[in-house]
């Protein structure tokens, strides 16, 4: 049983249960490749499940001598007979149970060569492989100003392999990023928000281990909106929480071609409402500023009280039109403040 | 079978804090990322939060971040959310949910824990 | 953030009937989206995820198909267990955020 592979895997070697002629269980975990030979011939070898004959092509394929199952679910559970042709002798009578506890195979198993464990799973070691390329099919991506942009590319491999991401060919961490990036590695995926034209570029992931190592590449263009009014970097100013007497600092990123000008702005209740009669919250204006574009925008609140908390907005506008995000500022009595503020993530909204 | 329980939840007052712990059992907790998701009385979902199996990622929604943190133990098979500055807002049910592998798709959820948040 | 618009919020139907729900992305993303089914007072159910594939134990006549920013839920031939609230989620971004639910009701 072998975890299955390359977008070339036609021109590798697959592995065969470890028992001709006798019957054989395995278990297998949900969404595990499978890829099993038929003898040491790939001619003349048919693979049938529950009596009928698997097609050469699909999710789960008779093929080359070959049984391949791009990933492994309830329903490909059974029984699966390797016949020859001809003689429709019985190559290999095979069992296949799923274990639903079973997701991948685990870290910590690092076999040499093919081997079955007493409860029948078996983890060879296996070169990096894509395990979902059907999510890989899309290489250009063209998207807005403003836009969230993922790359994803999923894989496995025994042991399991690390993933990095390049930038134009260099090691890309995004630390020069407006807003960084957001790195999942259980997802195999990076995702930049409120992508800019400085964000263009080839993106590579690079997938390896001890047994070798893969790469595929993306292509991001960033159509600017032109003109566009002022794009926000994501997550900024943030929610915060501070201590009575404390001073705080909401920062605003703003990403303009025009010109943009700034307004912190505090909601404010009048009459008991915070909305006007004409639908727009109440505000006061407390800083207004023109910045370069892509400066921070820092309001200071000095020495602050419980009337300073509230929700504050950074208003910024162009020629073209306006954006704002807002964010609440929570102030606790000295006594109440048992935790620290964690770092705030970056995020978009409109 | 896996098997998902929150638990936690109760009455506090504004700005006050709680702690949700859900209990996993059934499957290998340390491969999964998972997601608390909320959801207030005769209101949608709202996700809330999620970590990585290994807790090397989290992320928050908006409208959370900064009051609550999301962990895990693996050694003791659990999620935790800690809640602090609760708001009025923040009443509602309070669901962990495992992700599926390769995907953010919630492929099992837990009953819940009601977290009301008043004066 | 991402916003995700289900359609129509509520509708009525018989046994029988073939019932479509439409979820629409603010931006495009991607195939990344799932569909869950959800009974008062009980745990969201998983449905559909990634668009299209529909998740072990789940009864057929419940399909998804779109990307890019427009999706749809089709239950081909409703019946009475189908009764409930449903929710598309996305998560290409990573903050998953859930449409506003779509009542499936009696009519």
């Known amino acids: 049983l072998s975890l299955e592979a390359s977008e070339e895997m036609e021109q590798e070697p697959c592995l065969a249960p470890i028992l001709e002629q006798q019957e054989q269980v395995l278990t297998v975990a949900l969404g595990q490749p499978v890829r099993l030979c038929c003898g040491r011939t790939e001619r003349g070898r048919h693979w049938y499940k529950e009596g009928s004959r698997l097609a050469s092509a699909g999710r789960v394929r008779g093929w080359r001598g070959r049984l391949e199952i791009a990933s492994f679910l309830p329903e490909d559970a059974g029984r699966y007979l390797c016949l020859a042709r001809g003689s429709m002798t019985v190559v290999h009578n095979l069992t296949l149970l799923m274990d639903d506890s079973l997701t991948s195979i685990s870290n910590d198993e690092d076999p040499k060569t093919l081997s079955s464990s007493s409860s029948g799973h078996v983890y060879p070691q296996q070169a990096p492989y894509w395990t979902h390329p059907q999510r890989m099919e899309k290489k250009l991506h063209a998207v807005p100003a403003g836009n969230t942009v993922k790359f994803r590319c999923p894989a496995a491999g025994n042991p399991m392999p690390t993933i990095h991401w390049l930038k134009d060919g260099q090691a890309f961490h995004g630390e020069n990023r407006i807003g960084g990036i957001r790195l999942r590695h259980q997802h195999w995926s990076l995702v930049m928000e409120s992508v800019v034209p400085s964000d263009r570029g080839t993106y590579t992931c690079l997938v390896e281990n001890s047994l070798g190592s893969i790469r595929y590449s993306y292509l991001l263009d960033v159509l600017e909106r032109s003109p566009h009014r002022p794009i926000l970097q994501a997550g900024l100013p943030a929610n915060t929480t501070a201590v009575v007497g404390s001073d705080v600092e909401l920062l605003c990123k703003v990403y303009s071609d025009a010109q943009p000008h700034i307004q912190w702005l505090k909601h404010v209740v009048i009459n008991g409402s915070s909305f006007g009669a004409d639908g727009f919250p109440y505000v006061q204006v407390l800083k207004t500023t023109d910045i370069n574009s892509s400066e921070v925008e820092v309001l200071y609140l000095r020495n602050v009280s419980a009337e300073d908390a509230g929700e504050y907005t950074c208003l910024a506008g162009n020629s073209i039109g306006l954006s704002y995000q807002s964010a609440w500022l929570t102030v606790l009595p000295e006594e109440d403040l048992t935790w620290t503020t964690a770092t705030p993530e970056a995020r978009y909204t409109d | 079978q896996v098997q998902l329980l929150e638990s936690g939840g109760g009455l506090v007052q504004p700005g006050g804090s709680l702690r949700l712990s859900c209990a996993a059992s059934g499957f290998t907790f340390s491969d999964y990322a998972m997601s608390w998701v909320r959801q207030a009385p005769g209101k949608g979902l709202e996700w809330v939060s999620v970590?990585?199996?290994?807790?090397?990622?989290?992320h928050y929604a908006d409208s959370v971040k900064g009051r609550f943190t999301i962990s895990r133990d693996n050694s003791k098979n659990t999620l935790y959310l800690q809640m602090n500055s609760l708001r009025a807002e923040d009443t509602a049910v309070y669901y962990c949910?495992?992700?599926?592998?390769?995907?953010?798709?919630?492929?099992?959820w837990g009953q819940g824990t009601l977290v009301t948040v008043s004066s | 953030d991402i916003q995700m618009t289900q359609s129509p919020s509520s509708l009525s139907a018989s046994v029988g009937d073939r019932v479509t729900i439409t979820c629409r992305a603010s931006q495009d993303i991607s195939s990344d989206l799932n569909w869950y089914q959800q009974k008062p007072g009980k745990a969201p159910k998983l449905l559909i995820y990634?668009?299209?594939n529909l998740q072990s134990g789940v009864p057929s006549r419940f399909s998804g198909s779109g990307s890019g920013t427009d999706f749809t839920l089709t239950i081909s031939s409703l019946q009475p267990e189908d009764f409930a609230v449903y929710y598309c989620q996305q998560h290409y971004s990573p903050s998953h955020t859930f449409g506003q639910g779509t009542k499936v009701e009696i009519k």
């Open positions: 990634d668009a299209s």
């Open positions: 970590i990585e199996g290994d807790g090397s990622y989290t």
């Open positions: 949910a495992r992700e599926k592998t390769y995907s953010s798709a919630f492929d099992y």
